[in-house]
């Protein structure tokens, strides 16, 4: 004999307390699949979390973070404080990146500047706390007779197909 609970639709639960009636989920709860014997409690987006999607009888609420914070973890399980570019978050709050490191985002850690010399290149633009260095051409490319500027291609007259 088929279990009647298996056919209770999403948004309901098979209420054993009430002789296996497919009863609507109580407020602030949901069942996203059929055949459930209980409804799951809706996630509440409190404090630093804010509601991105309200809970319904068939789907859980979804949270994101209030301004000044960003989501971490699956389904935004945590909110982490934003820092400015050029900073990283430590246990003591936002701290400027140390010399030789940078962070171009409001989250994450400071990372070391690129070491241009490892690629045999020179530093074209110095790094800052917010930006990585920009590596230039290798010194060999700058030897006498070598042009560092590519000449522009000749312009075609309009209306003519290339030969």
């Amino acid at each position: 004999l088929q279990d009647p609970c298996s056919n209770c639709p999403a948004g309901t639960f098979c209420d054993n307390n009430r002789n296996q009636i497919c009863s609507p989920c109580p407020p602030n709860s949901f069942s996203s699949a059929g055949g459930q014997r209980t409804c799951d409690i809706c996630r509440q987006c409190k404090g630093v979390f804010r509601t991105r999607k309200e809970c319904s009888s068939t789907s859980n609420a979804e949270c994101d973070c209030t301004p000044g914070f960003h989501c971490l973890g699956a389904g935004c399980s945590m909110c982490e404080q934003d820092c400015k570019q050029g900073q990283e978050l430590t246990k003591k709050g936002c701290k400027d990146c140390c010399f030789g490191t940078f962070n171009d985002q409001k989250r994450g850690i400071c990372r070391p500047w690129t070491n241009c010399s490892l690629d045999g290149k020179s530093v074209l633009v110095n790094g800052t706390k917010e930006r990585d260095v920009v590596c230039g051409p290798s010194p060999a490319d700058l030897s006498p007779g070598a042009s560092s500027v590519t000449p522009p291609a000749p312009a075609r007259e309009p209306g003519h197909s290339p030969q």
């Epitope: 009647p4 056919n7 209770c8 639709p9 948004g11 309901t12 307390n17 009430r18 002789n19 296996q20 009636i21 497919c22 009863s23 609507p24 989920c25 109580p26 407020p27 709860s29 209980t38 409804c39």
Partner: antibody
């Protein structure tokens, strides 16, 4: 809009059967259980039974167990309540009611008056 | 069966005044999900009943906030903060927890 429309008044003789229909509209019929409640003149409301509209399983009050049958036609979004071996005490208004919130009957039919008279 | 007992059976009220109806169940109506399965209905003259409160204290959709439900063990109360002429009718409590679901005998609210 969401509504339940019941069949019209009935006059029956003692010992006969009556079948009252309740047509649902404006919502997904198979999602919500349907209950039957009756009210004899000047009396309190009396619960008779329910049907899981989507599944078809039913539960009845012991008082009516041997005489009541609740059935449904999902294609017509209609639930039926049949009461047999009618007696004078069965003269009442019969209501269908949707359990649209947990434990709460949020939508009621307009009622069907059943008169039992010889 | 769970017996539901209401009081008073008749309640004359002056418009604008508060009103209170009591309902006592012979057994606990507490579900394993933490809610009390107790409803309040109003049946206006010549009409079908309408749901006011479910799960003890939750107002049904469209019910004015002058209606409120409270619970204490097996004692339940429906309060109307300021009675209006349209509130006349018979108020029923009902338990939908244990078959057979049972109703109170009703409280008739009338305007003085």
């Amino acid at each position: 809009q969401v509504q339940l429309v019941q069949s019209g008044a009935e006059v029956k003789k003692p010992g006969a059967s009556v079948k009252v229909s309740c047509k649902a509209s404006g919502y997904t019929f198979t999602t919500y259980p349907m209950h039957w409640v009756r009210q004899a003149p000047g009396q309190r409301l009396e619960w008779m039974g329910w049907s899981n509209a989507g599944i078809g399983n039913t539960k009845y009050s012991q008082e009516f167990q041997d005489r009541i049958t609740i059935s449904r036609d999902t294609s017509a979004s209609t639930v039926y309540m049949e009461l047999s071996s009618l007696r004078s005490e069965d003269m009442a208004v019969y209501y269908c009611a949707r359990e649209g919130v947990a434990g709460g009957f949020d939508i009621w039919g307009q009622g069907t008056m059943v008169t039992v008279s010889s | 069966d769970i017996v539901m007992t209401q009081s008073p059976l008749s309640l004359p009220v002056t418009p604008g005044e508060p009103a209170s109806i009591s309902c006592r169940s012979s057994q606990s109506l507490l579900h394993s999900n933490g809610y009390n399965y107790l409803n309040w209905y109003l049946q206006k003259p010549g009409q079908s009943p309408q749901l006011l409160i479910y799960l003890g204290s939750i107002r049904a959709s469209g019910v004015p906030d002058r209606f409120s439900g409270s619970e204490s063990g097996t004692d339940f109360t429906l309060k109307i903060s300021r009675v209006e002429a349209e509130d006349v009718g018979v108020y029923y409590c009902m338990q939908p927890l244990q078959i057979p679901y049972t109703f109170g005998q009703g409280t008739k609210l009338e305007i003085k």
